[in-house]
C-alpha cells in the first residue's frame, strides 16, 4: 500500500495472507468459513510451493493469538483466467478446514448487486505490499481509503486505454494506491466486498494508472457455484 | 474435456537422447504448472519433472535433474520432456499429468494415457 | 526424500468384505499433501483420494481415507469386483514428491 498508514490492529478480520513456503505473497479475503478470495494470478509461479493462508494476522512476524496458519485443499482459479490478461482475475481457495470464527477472523459480506460503485466513493483497500517504490515491505497491515474513479476516465488513451471491462473497477492513484503484494486484496466500499486488487504489473502510485479492481458482483454465479 | 495425449516414446540406445511430448486440450492449459511422471517396469511411479505455468521454474528429483528437461509451448498447448544421456533404468511408460490445484503442488487430476520409453543397446 | 511404504503390497478380498490398505511415511506428512490413486491394468493412475479424505469426482462413497503424521490408510467399506485394482498413496509435503509401491487389491 503506498501513501497509506498501518491499519487498526485486527479491526479488518477478512483480510488474509496468501503464502507460499511460508512468505506473503498476496492479500485475500475470507468470503466463507472455508473460503477465501484471492487473484488467480497470485500463484502462477508456485509450481513446487507449498501455498497457505494466514489469517488473525496484523503482524506477518510477531506472534498473535487470533493467528492462524491454514493449508489450502484446493485452489479454484476463474476458468477463464489466464497469465496474458488481468480479465476473470479471481481465484478461491478451500481451506483444509474451517476457519476458527472469532472477533479477528470473521468472513466480509460481498457485492451480490452487479451495478458499478458510485463514482468518488471512498473505498477502503488494505495489504501486506510494499510501501515504497525501493520495494520495502511491511510487517503490520497497512491500509488507504481511495476514491473509486469512473470507467470512462480509467478508460482513457492516457490511463488504461480501453482495458478496463464492464467487470473491472478503477480507484484513483495519485501517490495513494495498492502496490506489488497487496494483489488479491479487498476493496472494501460501505463495509461490504466490491473489488478484488489485480495482480498485473502495473506502475503504482501514478494518477495516469489508476489501480484496477476485478468487480465481484459480476462474477456471484461463479462465486455461488464453486462455494456450493 | 480435459484431454492429455502424449507422444514420442521409442527404443533408444543408452547415452542416447529422446524429446516427448504432450498436447492438452479442455482445459486453460497456460494457467496450470504441469508435470512428467513415469511407471517403471516394475509397476513403480515416479515423478520426474514439473514446471510452472508461464514456464519460468522448472523442477526435477535428483534422478534426471542435469539429464532431463521440461519445458511448454502455451500458444500450442504443448509440453515437452527433453531427455538426454539416457540409461536403461529410465525404461518407463511416461505420463503427462495436470494437478488438482493449477499452481503444481498437489495431486495430479488428470493423466494421459501414456508414452514408452524404451533404453536398450 | 520421504519414503512410503505400502502394506500390504497384495490383498485378496471377497464382495462385500470391507478391508483396509496403510501407508507409512518415513517422516510426518501433513495430511493435506497424502493423496491416493487407483490404477486398473492397461490404463493410467486416476486421483482416487485427495489431501487424506476428500473423494475425487465420481469415487463410490464406499472409499473412505484416513490418517495423520506418518500413518494413512485407505478403506472400502464393502468391496465390488470392480475395485479390483492396484492403490498407490502419493506425498507432496517435501520434495521431492513420491509415491509408494502400490497395494494390490485382488477379488476371490
Known amino acids: 500500500i503506498l501513501g497509506g498508514r498501518e491499519a487498526e490492529a485486527h479491526a479488518r478480520p477478512y483480510m488474509a495472507s496468501v503464502q507460499v513456503n511460508g512468505e506473503h505473497l498476496c492479500g485475500g479475503v475470507l468470503v466463507a468459513e472455508q473460503w477465501v478470495l484471492s487473484a488467480a494470478h497470485c500463484l502462477e509461479d508456485a509450481a513446487d510451493g507449498k501455498v497457505q493462508v494466514l489469517l488473525g494476522a496484523h503482524s506477518l512476524s510477531q506472534p498473535e493469538p487470533s493467528k492462524r496458519l491454514y493449508d489450502v485443499l484446493r485452489a479454484v482459479p476463474h476458468p477463464d483466467s489466464r497469465p496474458d490478461t488481468i480479465d476473470h482475475d479471481l481465484l478461491l481457495l478451500q481451506l483444509s478446514e474451517k476457519a476458527t470464527l472469532g472477533p479477528a477472523v470473521r468472513p466480509l459480506p460481498w457485492q451480490r448487486v452487479d451495478r458499478d460503485v458510485e463514482p468518488g466513493t471512498l473505498c477502503d483497500v488494505a495489504g501486506w505490499g510494499i510501501v515504497s517504490h525501493a520495494g520495502r515491505r511491511p510487517d503490520r497491515l497497512q491500509h488507504v481509503l481511495l476514491p473509486v474513479l469512473d470507467r470512462a476516465t480509467c478508460n482513457r488513451r492516457t490511463h488504461h486505454d480501453g482495458a478496463i471491462t464492464q467487470r473491472m473497477m478503477c480507484a484513483e492513484s495519485n501517490r495513494r494506491d495498492s502496490c506489488k503484494g497487496d494483489s488479491g486484496g479487498p476493496l472494501v466500499c460501505g463495509g461490504v466486498l466490491e473489488g478484488v486488487v489485480t495482480s498485473g504489473s502495473r506502475v503504482c502510485g501514478n494518477r495516469k494508472k489508476p489501480g484496477i479492481y476485478t468487480r465481484v458482483a459480476s462474477y456471484a454465479a461463479w462465486i455461488d457455484s464453486v462455494l456450493a | 474435456e480435459v484431454h492429455l495425449v502424449e507422444s514420442g516414446g521409442d527404443l533408444v540406445k543408452p547415452g542416447g537422447s529422446l524429446k516427448l511430448s504432450c498436447a492438452a486440450s479442455g482445459f486453460t492449459f497456460s494457467r496450470y504448472g504441469m508435470s512428467w511422471v513415469r511407471q517403471t517396469p516394475d509397476k513403480r511411479l515416479e515423478w520426474v519433472a514439473t514446471?510452472?505455468?508461464?514456464?519460468?521454474?522448472?523442477y526435477y528429483p535428483d534422478s534426471v535433474k542435469g539429464r532431463f528437461t521440461i519445458s511448454r509451448d502455451n500458444a500450442k498447448n504443448t509440453l515437452f520432456l527433453q531427455m538426454s544421456s539416457l540409461k536403461s533404468e529410465d525404461t518407463a511408460m511416461y505420463y503427462c499429468?495436470?494437478?488438482?490445484?493449477?499452481?503444481?503442488?498437489?495431486?495430479?487430476?488428470?493423466w494421459g494415457q501414456g508414452t514408452t520409453l524404451t533404453v536398450s543397446s | 526424500q520421504i519414503v512410503l511404504t505400502q502394506s500390504p503390497a497384495i490383498m485378496s478380498a471377497s464382495p462385500g468384505e470391507k478391508v483396509t490398505m496403510t501407508c507409512r511415511a518415513s517422516s510426518s506428512v501433513s495430511s493435506t499433501y497424502l493423496h491416493w490413486y487407483q490404477q486398473k491394468p492397461g490404463s493410467s493412475p486416476k486421483l482416487w483420494i485427495y489431501?487424506?479424505?476428500n473423494l475425487a469426482s465420481g469415487v463410490p462413497p464406499r472409499f473412505s481415507g484416513s490418517g495423520s503424521g506418518t500413518s494413512y490408510s485407505l478403506t472400502i467399506s464393502s468391496v465390488e469386483a470392480e475395485d479390483a485394482a492396484t492403490y498407490y498413496c502419493?506425498?507432496?509435503?517435501?520434495?521431492?514428491?513420491?509415491f509408494g509401491a502400490g497395494t494390490k487389491l485382488e477379488l476371490k
Open positions: 502419493q506425498q507432496y509435503d517435501s520434495s521431492p514428491n513420491t
Open positions: 499429468a495436470r494437478p488438482l490445484n493449477y499452481y503444481g503442488t498437489s495431486s495430479f487430476d488428470y
Open positions: 489431501s487424506t479424505s
Open positions: 514446471i510452472s505455468s508461464a514456464g519460468s521454474y522448472t
